[in-house]
């Protein structure tokens, strides 16, 4: 197993409709093939396999398990949306990559971006 | 409706190893997310460690992390926990439980709607 250096924001912020974006950029030192995506959440004292996907370079990623998770590659970037998320799923989110094939195996994990989810506050009744 | 049935415990020393399995009865088990959790008399019911329907996906407490290890086998309808260097503060009641919802970021968190009748877990020093 052969390291790998991963980059990813610091913080990003949530919509108000839950919905998080932020990119996972590797330094690939070869031409990979087939690359493995996995978003971890450490927080709570828990750590969380949110969502993975394994997708061949230049095809978009699938998404197992009713995903919460959609994204897209571009080169050594990989853009992850996560949708549905709620104030208390606020926490560190961690982008780790592998390098599946061709040998040699390239395993990276990123520092973690921490998103932050705000519940939008319930629209007062209105007359009108 | 599923039916829950836990195995595997037992009172073993510190160190040592145990595999608890669940069995599960009902047509759907496939569609679960499934958790085990773990209850000290007096204390409330904890989380320990939750897999995705499918089995791809995990989430665990901190304080297991590296030393258990779940896993599923939807074909035979089983869940299963590896419990590796045990510590006696790993002594419990433990449970499994299925929840009907789709994986999320905060597993523990989902309804759990069935429970099994838990079993007993010791571990001396």
């Known amino acids: 197993c052969k390291a790998m250096h991963v980059a990813q924001p610091a913080v990003v912020l949530a919509s108000s409709r839950g919905i998080a974006s932020f990119v996972c950029e590797y330094a690939s030192p070869g031409k990979a093939t087939e690359v493995r995506v996995t978003v971890l959440r450490q927080a709570d004292s828990q750590v969380t396999e949110v969502c993975a996907a394994t997708y061949m370079m230049g095809n978009e990623l699938t998404f197992l398990d009713d995903s919460i998770c959609t994204g897209t590659s571009s080169g050594n970037q990989v853009n992850l949306t996560i949708q549905g998320l709620r104030a208390m799923d606020t926490g560190l989110y961690i982008c780790k990559v592998e390098l599946m094939y061709p040998p040699p195996y390239y395993l990276g994990i990123g520092n973690g971006t921490q998103i932050y989810v705000i519940d939008p506050e319930p629209c007062p009744d209105s007359d009108f | 409706e599923v039916q829950l049935v836990e195995s595997g415990g037992g009172l073993v020393q510190a160190g040592d190893s145990l595999r608890l399995s669940c069995a599960a009865s009902g047509r759907t088990f496939s569609n679960y997310v499934m958790g085990w959790f773990r209850q000290a008399p007096g204390k409330e019911r904890e989380f320990v460690s939750a897999?995705?329907?499918?089995?791809?996906?995990?989430s665990y407490t901190d304080s297991v992390k590296g030393r258990f290890a779940i896993s599923r086998d939807n074909a035979k309808k089983m869940l299963y926990l590896q419990m590796s260097s045990l510590k006696p503060e790993d002594t419990d009641v433990y449970y499994c439980?299925?929840?009907?919802?789709?994986?999320?970021?905060?597993?523990?968190?989902?309804?759990?709607?069935?429970w099994g009748q838990g079993t007993q877990v010791t571990v001396s020093s």
């Open positions: 897999i995705s329907p499918s089995g791809t996906l995990t």
């Open positions: 439980a299925a929840a009907r919802g789709p994986w999320s970021a905060r597993p523990s968190l989902l309804t759990y709607d069935y």
